[in-house]
């Protein structure tokens, strides 16, 4: 729409085209233009406000009739809205609707609202947080609108007490006095920035501040930026060298997303390690996600995410991407032997050797050990390298024999991505060198004594065939594009579901793939395509409908933000920003283009899965038709309750998992069974969890069990933004309806708490599986 | 408190029309739509017409389209009905109500069409 | 044009006695269901706004439920004052429809 996420917009009744605005503090619909009565903002907890009247839509619940008007900012009333779809929804899950010509709030009200000028939901640019730097606030986000002298102030101001532009923390200035400088992106690297040419790179360095790793995140993100990555000794050195600097402060290191190693928040590969001995990588139960670094020796430490501390924030000076296109099919030949894959070759050694032996005979076969470059790489080395035994570790050719620890491909090729297990890299404190494997099931790495004998892969340049109209194998007919064994194809037509075909997405590289295929939508309106995943009962349960009308159970999921917001729809993937993303829309009303998709072979088997007949281990439950088994830590039972991270770790220790479901039945039969356990209340932490920055918002599960099926309740948090993990409720002969999963005997409810909580908890493994000792 | 006072009614013959009115009090008239709702004798209700609260939008019942006009003055905070061409079928008593629930409604006034 | 079918058209009932009068629309109106009570000689006194709101005043024994096509208007415990006829009216979209009333007569 052109418009700037937090440009002030018209709000349009879909129904009617007419907009709204207020009057005497009522609202009603008028014709439709940008004159400032009818002018509204997102602001600070979901709340709208009015430029023109200074004031905010609410809903005063506690009168007999819900009256929808306009309310001071600090008023008592219900003043959050949030969206669903296009429907706008406040307290008690009353939705804005028009009712001749008058603004009314009403349950189930169908009404849709866009911003004008758009086709955008009010939320599509949702408000985003603008943190603070100096003042006396320490970093806490501006509080909009603020109240100075009479006047709601709705962004920042510029006076000539202030060095820059400046907000109030809090709702009244005038009262509490707290303020800050504002954190806003801004071209270039001139008022809160450093430049530093050499790294190309410009640093915010936010000294008196204290936010959690994600408000830090958030605020680097905000800016247009992203937390601290280092990637260099020499960086290093002038971090350590840098005069002001805060002694502590986050950087984007961390291994927030679920069963995946260390990362840098800016997905720059992270080959160059400095870690402190004393808090390293790979800590036992009680370690952390996040990364710290220490100024003065320069080390970076594992601490916990919910502390506060300082942060640097950094932007490169200009943002030239990149584009590799990786993901092009490209016919390849290689000698017998060898697998052709776009471009390369690579041979699987099936005998065991140290690296330097296995380095030594790819060499003898004029090729290296295998160098990995991008998710296609991987996906070579997951689907088509492993056939049989996927548990084997196998040799690559990244190695480090520097202090600090830097490592490097041995062919010689830049690192331009690291794709490290959980805990990992940990690497031996002063101890080289260093190798790294992966393991095949999911090709993720990990460090290595060099010594240590396993199988390897070397790689190799292929000769590359010409190119023909349509990729080979693939059907002759324009457009069709070959992926693995796949060919896909892109229909351009906007129709309602299930009309041209049923794409099945079932592995984060397929998903990488298509998203590939996606990206030239970006610049234009934003379009949706259709994929098959339906939810067909109208239960809450998302399946993938197939061919002959076969349900396919979800493998991989990737779910936008807030998603999947309601039962019975349909799935499309939204390009732009967020491309590829989830999101349910209506079967036959939406429109979206098309993927389809034709196998050169059979749809393979689903994976096999545990038997509900098979038995648990000693000291741990089932319960009829569960495929996993249950070991609840209740406070009866342990010594102190832990936080989500704690929790999980504590559960891994056991070579288990915080609890996960795949159905809705599932949970239900689940706290059927927890109820017996014990008596009274109890909240339990669960493996959902949204923490890891990748995700947007979207929620996983730590087991890495994709989620398929409504979870979270719609229940309005004013801090759901942090609330970043999510625990059950278990209790017996409740009072009041839970918002989900509710059945004759129990009421079962399901919330997102902070991760820093300390709550009981349930670890689960499956049926079959020996757990740790 | 809110108050809806119709007036006009009366006895008028076929084809002959009359002018409705409602005055309102105890609200904020100009933010509000209002409605004519109408009873036969002895029978259920009738939705009549809406106008929007600053007169922008009109909408007729099918029975009505054409012959009835509804009108506000905000400044006068009355609602009219102009109804023209009567008919013994448009015998009724008249209700205004305020939109957009229904909350609240006049007294109503009694139209009587015969020759 | 949206039907409204309410029944029972007549019923009796003594004080004290639960009521249940329905309301179904001949397509989906949302909440957009208004129930009425009006006595001889009076104009209609609205109860129930949304399907499910009670109106300012209204005693809370009056209760509405119901989203779609299908709605209820149910009495808790009858009162004498509550003998009179009840309407459903649908205003999701003109014209405005009424279904064609309820009496509620003592037994």
């Known amino acids: 729409s052109g418009r700037a996420a937090n440009d002030p917009f018209t709000i349009v009744h879909g129904n009617t085209g007419k907009c709204i605005k207020p009057v005497y503090g009522w609202i009603v619909a008028d014709d439709c233009d940008e004159t400032e009565d009818k002018l509204w903002k997102w602001v600070s907890q979901h709340r709208l406000f009015h430029l023109h009247s200074q004031k905010c839509l609410g809903l005063d619940i506690t009168k007999s009739v819900n009256e929808l008007r306009m309310f001071s900012c600090d008023s008592s009333a219900m003043l959050w809205w949030k969206c669903e779809h296009h429907s706008l929804y406040g307290a008690a899950r009353y939705r804005l609707a028009l009712k001749d010509g008058h603004g009314t709030a009403i349950s189930n009200a169908s009404d849709v609202w866009k911003k004008g000028g758009s086709e955008e939901s009010l939320c599509d640019q949702p408000y985003h947080e603008i943190y603070t730097r100096d003042g006396n606030s320490y970093g806490r986000p501006c509080e909009f609108p603020f109240l100075i002298d009479g006047t709601w102030h709705h962004d920042c101001i510029l006076d000539e007490d202030h060095s820059g532009p400046w907000c109030a923390t809090t709702l009244n200035y005038e009262y509490d006095r707290k303020w800050g400088i504002c954190l806003k992106p801004e071209n270039g690297c001139e008022d809160n920035w450093e430049k530093n040419e050499q790294f190309g790179s410009c640093y915010q360095f936010n000294t008196q501040t204290a936010l959690s790793w994600k408000e830090a995140y958030v605020s680097c993100q905000n800016q247009g930026a992203d937390l601290l990555s280092i990637n260099s000794a020499a960086e290093l050195t002038y971090l350590k060298e840098k005069e002001g600097i805060a002694k502590i402060f986050w950087i984007g290191l961390n291994q927030l997303y679920s069963a995946r190693g260390w990362e840098w928040s800016d997905h720059k590969p992270l080959n160059f390690l400095n870690w402190d001995p004393d808090r390293p990588s790979a800590p036992t139960i009680g370690g952390s996600s996040c990364a710290r670094m220490d100024a003065e020796s320069g080390l970076w430490q594992s601490f916990s995410c919910e502390a506060q501390l300082p942060y640097v924030c950094r932007k490169p000076l200009n943002n030239t991407v990149e584009l590799t296109d990786v993901w092009t099919y490209s016919d390849t030949r290689c000698d017998a032997g060898w697998l052709p894959n776009n471009g390369f070759c690579y041979l699987l050694v099936n005998e065991s050797n140290s690296w330097d032996k296995a380095h030594a005979k790819c060499k003898a076969f004029s090729s290296d050990l295998i160098s990995i470059h991008s998710l296609a790489d991987v996906e070579v080395v997951v689907t088509k390298l492993h056939n049989e035994d996927i548990k084997e570790e196998v040799w690559i050719g990244l190695k480090n024999i520097n202090i600090p620890t830097l490592f490097q491909w041995s062919d010689g090729t830049e690192v331009t991505l690291t794709y490290w297990d959980e805990n990992e890299p940990n690497v031996p404190y002063n101890k080289t060198p260093n190798c790294v494997s992966y393991l095949g099931e999911l090709g993720q790495w990990k460090v290595q004594s060099c010594e240590e004998k396993l199988k390897y892969v070397c790689k190799r340049k292929g000769e590359k065939l010409n190119d023909a109209s349509s990729d080979k194998m693939c059907p002759p007919d324009e457009g069709w594009k070959r992926h693995g064994e796949t060919c896909y194809k892109i229909y351009e037509d906007e129709v309602p579901f299930g009309t041209n075909c049923n794409l099945t997405i079932t592995s984060r590289f397929e998903q990488e793939y298509l998203n590939d295929l996606m990206k030239k939508y970006d610049k234009s309106l934003r379009k949706y395509f259709w994929t098959g995943l339906r939810d067909v009962d109208s239960c809450g349960e998302y399946n993938w409908a197939t061919v002959g009308g076969r349900r396919r159970a979800v493998t991989f999921s990737n779910w936008n933000f807030l998603e999947p917001a309601s039962p019975g729809g349909c799935v499309a993937m939204s390009t732009g920003k967020s491309v590829g993303k989830w999101e349910v829309k209506d079967c036959r009303s939406f429109k979206a283009l098309s993927i389809c998709k034709k196998m050169s072979g059979p749809l393979g088997p689903e994976e096999a899965s545990p038997k509900p007949d098979d038995p648990c281990p000693e000291g741990w439950q089932s319960f009829p038709a569960s495929l996993s088994c249950y070991k609840v830590f209740h406070a009866e039972r342990i010594v102190r309750k832990r936080n989500w991270e704690e929790a999980e770790r504590f559960c891994q220790a056991l070579g288990a998992h915080l609890s996960s479901f795949s159905h809705v039945d599932e949970i239900k039969e689940f706290l059927h069974f927890l109820t017996d356990q014990f008596s009274g209340q109890h909240w339990l932490w669960i493996g959902l969890n949204k923490r890891s920055p990748d995700l947007q918002g979207s929620w996983q599960w730590s087991d890495r069990t994709p989620v398929s099926t409504i979870i979270m309740p719609n229940e309005f948090q004013q801090d759901y933004d942090i609330r970043d993990c999510a625990a059950v409720k278990v209790f017996h002969r409740p009072w009041r309806r839970g918002w989900h999963f509710y059945d004759d005997r129990e009421f079962i409810y399901l919330r997102p708490f902070a991760c820093d909580t300390k709550l009981e908890w349930v670890c689960q493994i499956p049926k079959g599986r020996t757990p740790k000792t | 408190q809110v108050q809806l006072v119709e007036s006009g009614g009366g006895v008028v013959q076929p084809g002959r029309s009359l002018r409705l009115s409602c005055a309102a009090s105890?609200?904020?008239?100009?933010?509000?739509?209002m409605h004519w709702v109408r009873q036969a004798p002895g029978k259920g209700l009738e939705w009549v017409a809406v106008?929007?609260?600053?007169?922008?939008?009109?909408y007729y019942a099918d029975s009505v389209k054409g012959r009835f006009t509804i009108s506000r003055d905000n400044s006068k905070n009355t609602l009219y009905l102009q109804m023209n061409s009567l008919r013994a079928e448009d015998t009724a008593v008249y209700y205004c109500a305020r939109a957009p629930h229904f909350d609240y409604w006049g007294q109503g006034t009694l139209v009587t069409v015969s020759s | 044009d949206i039907q409204m079918t309410q029944s029972p058209s007549s019923l009796s009932a003594s004080v004290g006695d639960r009521v249940t009068i329905t309301c179904r629309a001949s397509q989906g109106i949302s909440s957009w269901l208004a129930w009425y009570q009006q006595k001889p000689e009076k104009a209609p006194k609205s109860l129930i706004y949304?399907?499910?709101s009670l109106q300012s005043g209204v005693p809370s024994r009056f209760s509405g439920s119901g989203s779609g096509t299908d709605f209820t208007l149910t009495i808790s415990s009858l009162q004498p004052e509550d003998f009179a006829t009840y309407y459903c009216?649908?205003?999701?979209?003109?014209?405005?429809?009424f279904g064609q009333g309820t009496k509620l007569e003592i037994k």
């Open positions: 009216q649908q205003y999701n979209s003109y014209p405005y429809t």
């Open positions: 105890g609200f904020i008239f100009s933010i509000y739509g």
């Open positions: 949304a399907a499910s």
């Open positions: 106008i929007w609260y600053d007169g922008s939008n009109k």
